[in-house]
């Protein structure tokens, strides 16, 4: 027998430097949690222990601090260079700053192979990326060769930027016949390594013969055996087992996100390859495990220019952008127009003739906003003011419901209405009239909702059992602010940009902004 | 396949400036940086810098940086060294490499400068 | 600079024979090492980066092993045509800095 140890992080999402226990800004250092300079301590005294050791990441290191905003990729490729990982898996978020943005930064600088089976390139972009991702690598491990084939969302073109020269294939119809090649190779130990979301790896793990392990990522699942040492709350036991088509039992593994766990599977192989045992566990990494004292020092160097970032201008306002509470949870805010149509113009993707954007649809709680910015400081915007107003490190994100789900939504925003509460809704592309003299729950007189289905965008009245796409922060989507029904009832949830970085690269393309109060939200009742 | 052509062998004055080239084929020349390595006789090898193609962007040994100017011309797909102020000890057989996960892979077959007065 | 010290300078072996050769950092270079082949007049030709990995077509009796500090090459049967001179380098950072190389003879 011939055991290998496969350490694997995903959904890292730019949190090089430790965070709260919440994934947040860290701020009581003897609390926090994650970070590069901590991962790398846990897995040098792994490697160092144990003889046959992989480290992987199933994609999704792009995206989601201001350490992204700055250096755009470059401190992925650096840092996971730092640790030495041994192959990535491309995510959604690589994608966020078009196929240039991924070339540039990242493929070209990593030293270590980035994967990806189901992402084909075409037209001139086909030679320009040929040899930067792979869709597999063959690995020596110790006196062994291991297989790793890798996988991406076939959703990316709606989640992010990729462009029209990169075709998404299904994931099954792609991996298998690498797998197959992989096998002609004499390669008998093969690890699938992508970033479709836990139902897809299940899949994966089901679909495609040869494959003896799944290494996954994009819907943050927290896998754990026994008792979570954290807040997460576990999906399944560590490694959830699938049983294949041809009966094998297929080890399937995720750790969660943002760089709080550090996946640790034990892997026993036979002489044939065949998959005899699997065990582990994430490793939580908390202050208990110290961070790598040269790691921390690189972090101090590059987190210099962070600082010197903060404090520049991304564009001005010439309107005062109303984030009080006063207004946000009561009426319709200028802040909350602004941050929706941020969000909008953040997903646009012209992905089919029919439609002028896959989404056309923003909610947006009122509470999340928690401050103003004054015009009267020569207009300017910093990335500073922003963290002010969104200071929650969260993101925003894409979600299918029902009109059913939406009218919920809508009637929860005023169902104890007059109280300062946070769940009041600021909206885009919505049109809400509410009624208070009514009772709670049939205070919604009139809900219109933007067309997508049409080349001149005009209001609707919205559909129960119609599907929608809707933008919105990741904190309502997990069913924040009592909105329960959202996250029963969503029908599919991506995760999306950081928030800051959203509405600050909207700012910056804007250059002036004026949002104003223009009738998005009305009461019908005189008082109001 | 992969085919890094360097230009003929050069004899040069003290003083003088010499420029190198690498003529790149079978891949797309922007996709990958390229190293410039030297190797002097009886010494080791010296690794004097590396150029991004696509956009010009350059790192240099710090003993060569004064002296040593990388460029490209992407339309031809050729890669350059240019070396000012030649002496002696500059007479070495200076190679081109292809970056592949940050190492050289690729190698020209090399051109001999000779420095003699 | 990274030292990198390569031992033996030179070797004489014979065809079939199994040979190693060590290469040595002055500081830890985090596995980022690559070995390369010159026989005279040709151009060098890479065999293994990252310690381990072999490049395309290169041959599998070549095969490396390390890490930190102290680094391995491996011919398991040397051929007539794997008599060359053997150089180390590592791209751990700049600058890359090469071994003194070892050269292996015919016995």
């Known amino acids: 027998a011939w055991e290998l140890t496969i350490l694997h992080t995903n959904d890292v999402h730019s949190r090089l430097e430790q965070t709260s226990e919440d994934s947040s800004k860290c701020v009581n250092a003897s609390r926090c949690m994650g970070g590069v300079a901590r991962l790398f301590t846990k897995v040098q005294q792994i490697r160092r222990a144990e003889p046959n050791v992989l480290l992987l990441d199933a994609g999704d290191q792009y995206q989601g601090t201001i350490w992204f905003t700055v250096y755009k990729g470059a401190e992925v490729a650096h840092f996971m260079n730092a640790l030495r990982y041994d192959a990535m898996a491309l995510g959604n978020h690589e994608f966020d700053n078009g196929v240039e943005g991924l070339i540039e930064p990242l493929l070209k600088e990593a030293k270590f192979p980035i994967l990806s089976a189901n992402i084909k390139a075409k037209g001139p972009l086909a030679s320009q990326i040929s040899g930067l991702y792979l869709p597999y690598k063959v690995l020596p491990v110790g006196d062994e060769v291991v297989g790793i084939v890798g996988y991406t969302s076939k959703e990316t073109p709606f989640l992010s930027n990729p462009g029209t020269n990169l075709v998404f294939e299904d994931e099954i119809t792609a991996l298998q016949p690498e797998v197959d090649k992989l096998k002609t190779l004499n390669v008998n130990k093969i690890i699938a390594l992508g970033h479709s979301g836990f139902e897809m790896d299940k899949l994966i793990a089901q679909k495609v013969r040869g494959v003896d392990v799944v290494v996954g990522g994009h819907s943050n699942t927290f896998l754990y055996t026994g008792n979570p040492p954290s807040k997460e709350v576990p999906a399944g036991k560590y490694p959830f087992i699938v049983t294949s088509d041809d009966g094998r039992k297929v080890p399937v593994v995720q750790a969660y996100a943002f760089g709080k766990y550090l996946g640790y599977l034990k892997i026993e192989f036979d002489e044939r390859g065949n998959v005899i045992s699997s065990h582990g566990n994430p490793i939580l990494l908390n202050s208990s495990i110290p961070e790598d004292p040269s790691i921390k020092a690189d972090i101090n160097k590059w987190r210099i220019k962070l600082d010197n970032y903060s404090t520049q201008e991304l564009g001005k306002t010439i309107v005062y952008l109303d984030g009080s509470s006063q207004s946000c949870r009561f009426r319709e805010c200028n802040m909350g127009n602004l941050i929706c149509d941020a969000m909008i113009n953040n997903n646009l993707r012209h992905t089919d003739e029919m439609f002028w954007n896959h989404v056309s649809m923003c909610i947006l709680n009122g509470g999340g906003i928690r401050s103003p910015i004054d015009e009267r400081n020569n207009g300017t915007i910093t990335w500073e003011n922003l963290a002010a107003v969104l200071p929650f490190g969260g993101t925003f994100d894409l979600v299918q419901l029902k009109g059913s789900t939406l009218k919920k939504a809508f009637e929860h925003s005023v169902h104890r209405y007059g109280q300062s509460t946070g769940e009041f809704l600021q909206v885009g592309g919505i049109h809400v009239v509410y009624d208070l003299s009514r009772k709670p729950g049939d205070r919604v007189v009139k809900l219109d909702v933007l067309c997508t289905k049409c080349r001149v965008p005009s209001y609707d009245p919205l559909k129960m059992d119609e599907v929608y796409k809707v933008i919105l922060p990741n904190f309502l989507a997990n069913g924040g602010d009592g909105f329960q029904m959202i996250k029963d009832e969503l029908l599919r949830h991506d995760s999306g940009d950081q928030d800051i970085n959203v509405v600050s690269t909207y700012i910056s393309k804007m250059k002036v902004i004026y949002p104003a109060v223009e009738g998005r939200i009305k009461f019908s009742t005189g008082s109001h | 396949q992969v085919q890094l052509v360097q230009s003929g062998a050069e004899v040069k004055k003290p003083g003088a400036s010499v420029k190198l080239s690498c003529k790149a084929s079978?891949?797309?020349?922007?996709?990958?940086?390229m190293h410039w390595v030297r190797q002097a006789p009886g010494q080791r090898l010296e690794w004097i810098g590396n150029?991004?193609?696509?956009?010009?962007?350059?790192k240099y040994n710090e003993k060569f940086k004064s002296r040593a100017t990388l460029t490209v011309d992407k339309s031809a797909s050729t890669a350059y060294l240019e070396l000012s102020s030649l002496r002696s000890e500059d007479t070495a057989v200076y190679y081109c490499?292809?970056?592949?996960?940050?190492?050289?892979?690729?190698w020209g077959q090399g051109t001999t400068v000779t420095v003699s007065s | 600079d990274i030292q990198m010290t390569q031992s033996p300078s030179s070797l004489s072996a014979s065809v079939g024979d199994r040979v190693t050769i060590t290469c040595r950092a002055s500081q830890d270079i985090n596995s980022y090492l690559t070995w390369f082949q010159q026989k005279p007049g040709k151009a060098p030709k890479s065999l293994i980066y990252r310690t381990n990995i072999l490049l395309d077509g290169v041959p599998s009796r070549f095969s490396g092993s390390g890490s930190g500090t102290d680094f391995t090459l491996t011919i398991s049967s040397l051929q007539p045509e794997d008599f060359a001179t053997y150089y180390c380098l590592q791209y751990h950072e700049f600058p890359v800095t090469f071994g003194g190389g070892t050269k292996l003879e015919i016995k």
């Open positions: 490499a292809r970056r592949d996960y940050g190492s050289p892979s690729y």
């Open positions: 150029i991004n193609p696509s956009n010009g962007g350059t």
């Open positions: 079978g891949y797309t020349f922007t996709s990958y940086w």
